[in-house]
Interface confidence: medium
Amino acid sequence: SGTTNTVAAYNLTWKSTNFKTILEWEPKPVNQVYTVQISTKSGDWKSKCFYTTDTECDLTDEIVKDVKQTYLARVFSYPAGNVESTGSAGEPLYENSPEFTPYLETNLGQPTIQSFEQVGTKVNVTVEDERTLVRRNNTFLSLRDVFGKDLIYTLYYWKSSSSGKKTAKTNTNEFLIDVDKGENYCFSVQAVIPSRTVNRKSTDSPVECMGQEKGEFREI
């Protein structure tokens, strides 16, 4: 007959980008299943991902209710096919996650350059304001809506013919930079939350260069 021994989950890890938040853990289950619970510091436990054989659980729906709260999750282990069975202490084995505060810790997703427009010796570069899964009044908020002025973007730009990079910063989603007339430039942007201690920067956006489709050019 099959064993009823279960092992507690371990290596509980939060994976979160732009508030899309998944709890991952080990081990891959052998003759056991998992259920996850999540709570704020002062709230009740809510169960998710009931009796799953996965080793991850999407908790986005819970954390987006208030991204500034601090959350704790726990993963319960049950014998497969006998979820009423308990550990030796009279309750299912479980392991706690580290605390997680989405606003402070979610990774910033790779930004995208939405467009650039040249007018004479000025180029306006616009960063796409990415939608998050955070809602307010039944509307999904953008990254800028959520972070406000805590979020800045850094623009890296350089002449196509050279490797010397210049930078500009904005706490909106637009840059207006000076360029040399007749020169083609390439652009990349990075999202930054300067006052964070962890996960301060996103990866760089894909590079976009003048002379490609994204841009518009108007000579004056």
Partner: antibody, heavy 118, light 107 residues
Framework: EVQLVQSGAEVKKPGASVKVSCKAS????????MNWVRQAPGQGLEWMGE????????TYNQKFKARVTLTVDQSTNTAYMELSSLRSEDTAVYYC???????????WGQGTTVTVSS | DIVMTQSPDSLAVSLGERATINCKAS??????IAWYQQKPGQPPKLLIY???NRYTGVPDRFSGSGSGTDFTLTISSLQAEDVAVYYC?????????FGGGTKVEIK
């Protein structure tokens, strides 16, 4: 160690201007908003405005918008608050404060007493 | 502007006893609330942010709770060094606004 060191006490006449400085050290000056908060004698705290040292962009409390100017000097990691057209009710301690991620003020200067008296 | 109303204005508590300070916002501020302690002649000191998170180095006798419009700062066991004025502040919507303060004294 993060430190915000403010300039010394000032005595001004009504109608004059005062400029208070706040020198930051121990952290990346351009990475945090600098705020200004004042406290009249025996009274509570009143937010005046904030400046982004990276861009120089400012946001003001409407109450002070016509009279206050916030500036920074990145070369010396110093923020400035200038208040014009002073009146007696501007007598207060003026604090600079670093705004942490999400909004709270985690570090404060020691305060600068401004006295407006004829 | 969001108005923050603190109560009581002053509070006298015996050493080792619990002190509770309330703060009410004129509209919902989610959990965008910070609490500060100010002693005479000193600048305010941040105690709690995001309504319930203790700031670095703050003793665990200080705790915050609440969400929406009603918030509480609790000192679980009052110490002599806790005598001060305590302020709540909303950092949900600019202009950032403070409560009027609560003076905590030893009974």
């Amino acid at each position: 160690e993060v430190q915000l060191v403010q300039s010394g006490a000032e005595v001004k006449k009504p109608g004059a201007s005062v400029k208070v400085s706040c020198k930051a050290s121990g952290y990346s000056f351009t990475g945090y908003y600098m705020n200004w908060v004042r406290q009249a004698p025996g009274q509570g705290l009143e937010w005046m405005g904030e400046i982004n040292p990276s861009t120089g962009g400012s946001t003001y409390n409407q109450k002070f918008k016509a009279r206050v100017t916030l500036t920074v000097d990145q070369s010396t990691n110093t923020a400035y608050m200038e208040l014009s057209s002073l009146r007696s009710e501007d007598t207060a301690v003026y604090y600079c404060a670093r705004r942490e991620l999400g909004g709270p003020f985690g570090y404060w200067g020691q305060g600068t007493t401004v006295t407006v008296s004829s | 502007d969001i108005v923050m109303t603190q109560s009581p204005d002053s509070l006298a508590v015996s050493l080792g006893e619990r002190a509770t300070i309330n703060c009410k916002a004129s509209q919902s501020v989610s959990n965008g609330i910070a609490w500060y302690q100010q002693k005479p002649g000193q600048p305010p000191k941040l105690l709690i942010y995001f309504a319930s998170n203790r700031y670095t180095g703050v003793p665990d006798r200080f705790s915050g709770s609440g969400s929406g419009t009603d918030f509480t700062l609790t000192i679980s066991s009052l110490q002599a060094e806790d005598v001060a004025v305590y302020y709540c502040q909303q950092d949900y919507s600019s202009p950032w606004t403070f409560g009027g303060g609560t003076k905590v004294e030893i009974k």
